[in-house]
Interface confidence: low
């Protein structure tokens, strides 16, 4: 007869173990007794349990309410045994020993390999912001073992750099994903990939990056200089802007108070029909918590009762 | 991508034999057992026969066993099951079916089955 | 061998119902349990292994839960492609057997 039994035997943390020792005998060959013992090297074979045809399961005291046997029906020539809730603590060799009727002894050895799948974390790194150099986007941290991979999956240009801290039973990673914020970044995914043989499919944690920036402020509605003439209703004027965060916009005039019934909407100063106390400097102000910008439009309403024509001046400032 | 496709089924005569056939493709063929299930008209599924990866290890529901035998072709990527003395009850769709060894005789649920061949016994 | 007793044996459903299947091991299996769904002249579809986990690519809606002897599959929200024969089997020991299955009909 031989003895079946694994190479390998691979399980999760707190999953149960099936440690294979099956006897595989001529007719008539009965087995008396299998034990199993951990045999690793260095150390003393430590028992973990006994299986007697007759007397049944003795479990060590070290591995008490830990070691059962299959549940039945049981092949009297199967010397299997469950080691219940995996620990790190259990990861080495294992040794069963089998005593047969009239063959003799026969021992087999299997190695358990425990198998600890990582719990990442994703940290961001400081507040990004346009125009700074090369900066800490993210790292991601994944503890496990055997060592897990981490990796990161985005369409954004970036370097990264990975270090390793080795544990006595595992070991932990962390990878650092760095960039030179542009506003084109803004919203865009950054995903840490941890892999892991414990794990069933790659665990991925995904972070949005937020890069501060603000853009040149514009005013529109002075394209057509005929169209501001007295009387005419309906006139505005745009301030043209974006930001992140999304800015606000204040509307002035440089040479006094806002004409009354002038109306201030967000970024829309609307004007009510114009006269000639419309005409001035006017300035949009755009700010976010990142910087601030103007830009400043000069309006010249066109009376057509003078021959004066009229002009119009654009001046942009940060 | 995983590929199971059997072939060989058809109408046969109770007491005589057929061969089925399972190409696979898209896997190691060689790492994963493999078994046989067969779902009689308007039935449940039954479990039929097993075999390792390697070949080394079979196995047989009582109500095959001494009849069909299961084997396999690691290069050419093919499971096989003969059957022989057939019987009227033997009549049913039979689907080959991969699953991973996670210890000795240990197996994991079948994540990839074929499409299934009819074989009819019948006079 | 293991018995796997199914029950119901059907049950008539609307989209949208919340439905539960429950198998019985006539002994200990751990969590080594499946739950399969079967499409007329189609092949069994893994939706359910180790009792609890989604198969790849099976939609959230589908959860299995149990272990040693009773086990549940639910259906959180019953869509129009989900009718059908739902089995679930054991492949703790072999013979690996299957529960006799339960036809989910339209109400």
């Known amino acids: 007869g031989e003895l079946e039994t694994s190479d390998v035997v691979t399980v999760v943390l707190g999953q149960d173990a099936k440690l294979p020792c099956f006897y595989r005998g001529d007719s008539g060959e009965q087995v008396g007794q299998v034990a199993w013992a951990r045999a690793d090297a260095g150390e003393g074979a430590q028992e973990l349990a006994l299986l007697h045809s007759k007397y049944g399961l003795h479990v060590s005291p070290a591995y008490e309410g830990r070691v059962e046997q299959p549940p039945p029906p049981r092949n009297p020539l199967d010397g299997s045994v469950l080691l219940r809730n995996a620990v790190q603590a259990d990861e080495g060799e294992y040794e069963c020993r089998v005593s047969t009727f009239p063959a003799g002894s026969f021992q087999a050895r299997l190695r358990l390999r425990v198998l600890v799948p990582p719990l990442p974390s994703l940290n961001p790194g400081p507040a990004l912001e346009e125009g700074q150099g090369l900066t800490l986007a993210a790292s991601c941290t994944a503890e496990g073992s055997p060592a897990p991979s981490v990796t990161w999956d985005t369409e954004v240009k970036g370097t990264t750099s990975s270090r390793s801290f080795k544990h006595s039973r595992s070991a932990a990673v962390t990878s650092e994903f760095h960039l030179v914020p542009s506003r084109s970044m803004n919203g865009q995914p950054l995903t840490c990939v941890v892999s892991h043989p414990g794990l069933l499919q790659d665990q991925r944690i995904t972070h949005i990056l937020h890069v501060s920036f603000l853009a040149e402020a514009s005013v529109r509605g002075l394209e057509d200089q005929n169209l501001w003439h007295v009387g005419r209703e309906g006139a505005m004027l745009k301030c043209l802007s974006e930001g992140q965060p999304p800015p606000s916009y204040n509307w002035t005039r440089l040479d006094g108070p806002l004409p009354s019934g002038v109306r201030v909407d967000g970024d829309t100063l609307g004007f009510p029909p114009l006269t000639t106390e419309h005409s001035g400097i006017y300035v949009c102000h755009v700010s976010n918590e990142f910087s601030s910008r103007d830009s400043q439009v000069t309006v010249d309403v066109l009376d057509p009762q003078e021959d004066s024509g009229k002009q119009v001046d654009l001046v942009s400032a940060s | 991508e995983v590929q199971l496709v059997e072939s060989g089924g058809g109408l046969v005569q109770p007491g005589g034999s057929l061969r089925l056939s399972c190409a696979a493709s898209g896997f190691t063929f060689s790492s994963y057992a493999m078994s046989w299930v067969r779902q009689a008209p308007g039935k449940g599924l039954e479990w039929v026969s097993a075999i390792s990866g390697s070949g080394g290890s079979t196995y047989y529901a009582d109500s095959v066993k001494g009849r069909f035998t299961i084997s396999r072709d690691n290069s050419k990527n093919t499971l096989y099951l003969q059957m022989n003395s057939l019987r009227a009850e033997d009549t049913a769709v039979y689907y080959c079916a991969r699953a991973e060894l996670l210890a000795f005789d240990v197996y994991t649920a079948s994540d990839y089955w074929g499409q299934g061949t009819l074989v009819t016994v019948s006079s | 061998d293991i018995q796997m007793t199914q029950s119901p044996s059907s049950l008539s459903a609307s989209v949208g119902d919340r439905v539960t299947i429950t198998c019985r091991a006539s002994q200990g299996i751990s969590s080594y349990l499946a739950w399969y769904q079967q499409k007329p002249g189609k092949a069994p579809k893994l939706l359910i292994y180790?009792?609890?986990s989604l198969q790849s690519g099976v939609p959230s809606r589908f959860s299995g839960s149990g272990s040693g002897t009773d086990f549940t599959l639910t259906i959180s929200s019953l869509q129009p492609e989900d009718f059908a024969t739902y089995y679930c089997?054991?492949?703790?020991?072999?013979?690996?057997?299957f529960g006799q299955g339960t036809k989910v009909e339209i109400k």
């Open positions: 089997q054991q492949h703790y020991t072999t013979p690996p057997t």
């Open positions: 180790a009792a609890s």
